[in-house]
């Protein structure tokens, strides 16, 4: 009696997910009869994947008929495939009997699921951070195989090189997943920013996946502020001019205080637009002099965006106004407090206590 | 386990047709031939036909083919095979059997139909 | 058509002896590099069983007694010694073509 083989020619096959997977076995000889199993993996616990004489395998065809007169092919069809169905598959010969009894078995062949990354979806900090300050994004991807992939930061098409990045699992998994944290240094110009992670991977053919971020959701631009006076008018007020400007997002809440006490709150609404995406916004304070006999101390105190109020200060000297109409001398600007552009500076009135 | 079980013994008037079942039980019903045989009382045996459930494809005994149809129920796994214009000389026990190794050959057998033809 | 003829058609053996049944085909049941012949026994009041098949190979649980031999046309049932549970009629059937069943050789206790 001729030695059967069982001949598996392919080590490996390498099908695209939802396609499906040809793994072929031919026998050598019609001897023994009997049938032939398919399963995926070897020893005990090994998983029946078809079984030509018995039982409901509704993802698995067999190439050939069956039935067709001296048969040795037994090459069987897997549709939808999913990276679950990875594995090494063995077609299995069984000599007839009650039962079966196991002949021999072919080589193996090892299925690989080519899984494209799902989108990968970009998230950045909770909360807002201060301009000049540095924030992490997070940019995940999930369900790809094979394993190898290539993820890149880019912020406004310039790749960026503080990023982490790790592939899960470590080990030989039926699928993975990508999750890579970038660091990006917030500046003021950045309200119309965007960073993109580009995922590559084998089954993308070329075309990378991208999520975006834009920094607008994670960037807080702190105002400048300015107070100034106009001229005296004509009946003795002083118009004080409070310029807010180059701040976002555009949640600001004004108010000025005429000796320390409020004379007037406001909210920033519907404001136009600059070009780098920031906002101004000028308050006018109208203070008749000649209702003061002392000087006058106005504070423009902003909040922005919920952070400790910001104040600029501005003295109104009343001795400096003569009372008789027409006359131009300018109230004396007493406000020392000039602050930075990056970050708020404590005023003179010691209302900031907190540094971003 | 392979089991094949056909049906009663009949009793037919000559000129009248008999169908006899055969239900399958313990494989693929669709992945394999069934063969009808049939054997005279202290005669030999004698093959009528076969049939693949899978796609109905029939093979005939030229002498029986414009007597015998061949024909299956895959939803209950039962083969049929009806012989019409019944004669004395068709009296005999009709076996199913069940071509394991596509070999043309029959490998399991069913307990045998007796079919009688008598006026 | 291929036609069987098995001879002889009847046979008595001691028991322990050996038993010799051929079984010749009207042309060469030779095809794809098998020998296309099947050799079935059949007892009284009992559907026929598989013994042979492709004329050299034993059927599972067949006894080690029986084998088959031949090629082309001439075709041989040996059983080396025989049991009493071996008296039956045996059959040779051919699958070259469709099949065909050689008239049967009954085998009975000298």
């Known amino acids: 009696e001729e030695e059967l083989q069982v001949i598996q020619p392919e080590k490996s096959v390498s099908v695209a997910a939802g396609d499906s997977a040809t793994l072929n076995c031919t026998v050598s000889s019609l001897i023994p009869v009997g049938p032939i199993q398919w399963f995926r993996g070897a020893g005990p616990g090994r998983e029946l994947i078809y079984n030509l004489k018995e039982g409901h395998f509704p993802r698995v065809t067999a190439v050939s008929d069956p039935t067709k007169r001296n048969n040795m092919d037994f090459s069987i069809r897997i549709s939808n495939i999913t990276p679950a169905d990875a594995g090494t598959y063995y077609c299995v010969k069984f000599r007839k009997g009650s039962p079966d009894v196991e002949l021999k078995s072919g080589a193996g062949t090892e299925l690989s699921v080519r899984a494209k990354p799902s989108a990968p979806v970009v998230s950045g900090p909770a909360v807002r951070a201060t301009a000049e300050h540095t924030v992490s994004f997070t940019c995940e991807s999930h369900g790809f195989s094979p394993r190898d992939i290539t993820l890149k930061w880019f912020k406004n098409g310039n790749e960026l090189s503080d990023v982490q990045t790790n592939v899960d699992p470590a080990g030989k998994s039926v699928s993975y997943s990508i999750r890579s944290t970038a660091r990006v240094l917030l500046t003021r110009r950045d309200v119309h920013s965007q960073v993109i992670c580009e995922v590559a991977h084998v089954t993308l053919q070329g075309d990378p996946l991208r999520g975006t971020a834009n920094l607008s959701e994670a960037i807080r631009v702190p105002p400048f502020l300015e107070v100034t006076q106009q001229s005296m008018r004509a009946d003795n007020q002083v118009n004080v001019t409070c310029q807010v400007t180059k701040f976002y997002p555009q949640r600001l809440q004004l108010t000025w205080l005429e000796n320390g006490n409020v004379s007037r709150t406001e909210m920033a609404s519907a404001l136009p637009e600059n070009k780098d995406g920031t906002y101004n916004w000028t308050s006018w304070l109208l203070v008749n002099v000649s209702a003061h006999r002392d000087d006058v101390k106005l504070t423009c105190q902003v909040e922005h965006d919920g952070q400790p109020a910001v104040n600029k200060s501005f003295s109104v000297k009343v001795s400096a106004h003569p009372k008789e109409q027409g006359s131009n001398t300018a109230a004396e600007n007493t406000g020392t407090n000039e602050r930075g552009s990056s970050d708020y500076k404590d005023d003179d009135d010691k209302h900031h206590h907190h540094h971003h | 386990q392979v089991q094949l079980v056909q049906s009663g013994a009949e009793v037919k008037k000559p000129g009248a047709s008999v169908k006899v079942s055969c239900k399958a039980s313990g494989y693929t019903f669709t992945n394999y031939w069934i063969n009808w045989v049939r054997q005279a009382p202290g005669q030999g045996l004698e093959w009528i036909a076969m049939?693949?459930?899978?796609?109905?494809?029939?093979h005939y005994n030229q002498i029986f083919k414009d007597r015998a149809t061949l024909t299956t129920d895959t939803s209950t796994s039962t083969a049929y095979m009806e012989l019409r214009s019944l004669r004395s000389d068709d009296t005999a026990v009709y076996y199913c059997?069940?071509?394991?190794?596509?070999?043309?050959?029959?490998?399991?057998w069913g307990r045998g139909t007796l079919v009688t033809v008598s006026s | 058509d291929i036609v069987l003829t098995q001879s002889p058609d009847s046979l008595a053996v001691s028991l322990g002896e050996r038993a010799t049944i051929n079984c010749r085909a009207s042309q060469s049941v030779r095809s794809s590099g098998y020998n296309w012949i099947f050799w079935y026994q059949q007892k009284p009041g009992q559907p026929p069983k598989l013994l042979i098949y492709l004329a050299s190979n034993r059927d599972s649980g067949v006894p080690d007694r029986f084998s088959g031999s031949g090629s082309g046309t001439d075709f041989t049932l040996t059983i080396s010694s025989l049991q009493a549970e071996d008296v039956a009629v045996y059959y040779c059937?051919?699958?070259?073509?469709?099949?065909?069943f050689g008239q049967g050789t009954k085998l009975e206790i000298k």
């Open positions: 059937q051919e699958s070259r073509e469709l099949p065909t």
């Open positions: 059997a069940m071509d394991y190794g596509s070999l043309y050959a029959m490998d399991y």
């Open positions: 049939i693949d459930p899978s796609d109905s494809e029939t």
